[in-house]
């Protein structure tokens, strides 16, 4: 198809070559001002379109993206051609940065309905270069945090070393979706609920003397309790006696709850305690047994092969660690009468 | 955040097999939860399989009696055995695990099946 006809934007992604980040393309940018977006071609330009073919409407999942190769050959499915590229209703995305990324993307609807659609395209020309300026170290990151319940904000990386003041107007998206009342280079968030967690889009424009781009960056934004303030705490053992059969293999449980550290290195081991030495017994590895928002339980076993005379004079210990502080639970083993 | 390496990906003729393997690093214990997910081209991304650390595990209705999925000594490192490939297989997939209950995702290895 001709695509002389598509609206054009130019896109800019600097991306950082010190961390992982991801990009977007749009294929609608649904902000009533571009009402032109898919223009006909009769209309003059003070006439209102009565419809757009496929702006804001459902057809939005079903878009076809192409890219053009900058040698001239005909238009590539992306879909075929782009593996680290994935569609997903109206977004493109950009799972890995790189200036190979860079070029002509272009969109469509897939279903032509009427005459007018041919040129109901949009043409994106972007352009990726990795960051050089040294001068912002302390820019904001591609992966932000938000703790549930309390205030936090969202900056868009590609500005966060500017002040309020300076910073141009930033066009805000969560998960493709326009966040009209967002204009500043931060969104400030009163009370942070699990709702806020999601993909954020800041976009803003950079002009010269000879075109204007859209600066573009990619925000994931995930919500997160505070880090715990108490010591891992132990479910299990509760008693500190246990009846055992002589002779008999005999596997011992220590579950402790964790409470959540964004920085976590949890330790769970045990160790026997026999009169005056105690030593760390080699046990399978730790596993969680459960996992939620605020904490991970985490389970590791001593087994014993069987159980001696001997076992009955020892402590078996666990013991429980994180940043804040250490619990223990020892159990002395105890022949089962009868 | 926990890295997810993911490997194994490739092109494959319809029938074929692919094994794809996924670890997760610098992490103490065994997460409880691991697993794949795919997303072809122009869909959300839908469940593979995933097994817990305590042995279940759960297929999407499209992979059931063709993929098997498994844990390493139940550790960190999850396999997806692949028979009987479909062109409809065709995607990229992810490999996740749950860590204080939240997704963390790979970056995603390739999966293609055609003639």
């Known amino acids: 198809f001709n695509i002389s006809g598509c609206s054009t934007k130019k896109l800019l992604w600097t991306y950082s070559t010190r961390s992982e980040e991801e990009f977007v393309l749009f294929c609608d940018l649904p902000e009533p001002q571009k009402s032109h977006f898919c223009h006909r071609n009769r209309l003059s330009p003070k006439q209102v379109p009565e419809h757009l073919p496929f702006m804001g409407s459902n057809d939005l999942s079903d878009v076809q993206w192409y890219q053009q190769p900058s040698n001239g050959d005909p238009l590539e499915d992306i879909r075929k051609s782009y593996p680290h590229i994935i569609q997903d209703k109206c977004t493109l995305h950009f799972l890995t940065p790189g200036v190979n990324n860079s070029g002509s993307y272009i969109c469509r609807p897939k279903m032509i309905k009427s005459p007018y659609d041919v040129a109901c395209c949009v043409k994106m020309i972007l352009e990726v270069k990795p960051q050089t300026n040294a001068s912002c170290e302390y820019s904001a990151s591609h992966k932000q945090d938000l703790l549930l319940g309390s205030t936090g904000s969202i900056s868009c990386p590609s500005l966060s070393c500017q002040s309020d003041a300076q910073s141009p107007a930033v066009t805000w998206y969560k998960n493709g979706k326009l966040l009209s009342v967002e204009r500043s280079n931060r969104i400030v968030v009163d009370e942070v609920y699990d709702y806020h967690q999601g993909t954020y889009v800041c976009d803003y424009t950079q002009s010269d003397t000879v075109s204007s781009w859209t600066v573009r960056a990619v925000v994931q934004v995930r919500t997160i309790v505070g880090d715990t303030k108490l010591k891992p705490d132990i479910l299990d053992p509760v008693e500190d006696t246990l009846e055992v059969e002589l002779g008999k293999p005999l596997t011992i449980s220590c579950k402790a709850r964790f409470g959540f550290e964004r920085v976590f290195n949890p330790v769970i081991k045990w160790y026997i305690k026999d009169s005056d030495l105690e030593w760390e017994v080699s046990v399978p590895e730790a596993k969680s047994i459960k996992s939620t928002l605020k904490d991970e339980i985490i389970e590791r076993n001593i087994i014993l092969e069987k159980v001696t005379q001997r076992d009955l004079r020892r402590k078996f210990v666990c013991f429980v660690q994180n940043s804040i502080g250490n619990t223990t639970q020892s159990v002395q083993l105890k022949e089962k009468r009868g | 955040d926990v890295p997810l390496q993911e490997s194994g990906g490739g092109l494959v003729q319809p029938g074929g097999s692919l094994r794809l393997s996924c670890r997760a690093s610098?992490?103490?214990?065994?997460?409880?939860?691991m697993g794949w997910y795919r997303q072809a081209p122009g869909e959300q991304r839908h469940l593979v399989a995933t097994v817990t650390t305590g042995g279940h595990i759960n297929y999407g209705d499209s992979v059931q009696g063709r993929f098997t999925i498994s844990r390493e000594n139940n550790g960190n490192v999850v396999e997806l055995q692949m028979h009987s490939l479909k062109p409809e297989d065709t995607a990229v997939y992810f490999c996740?695990?749950?860590?204080?209950?939240?997704?963390?995702w790979g970056q995603g290895t390739q999966v293609t099946v055609s003639s």
């Open positions: 996740n695990a749950i860590y204080f209950g939240q997704d963390i």
């Open positions: 610098g992490v103490g214990f065994s997460i409880y939860t």
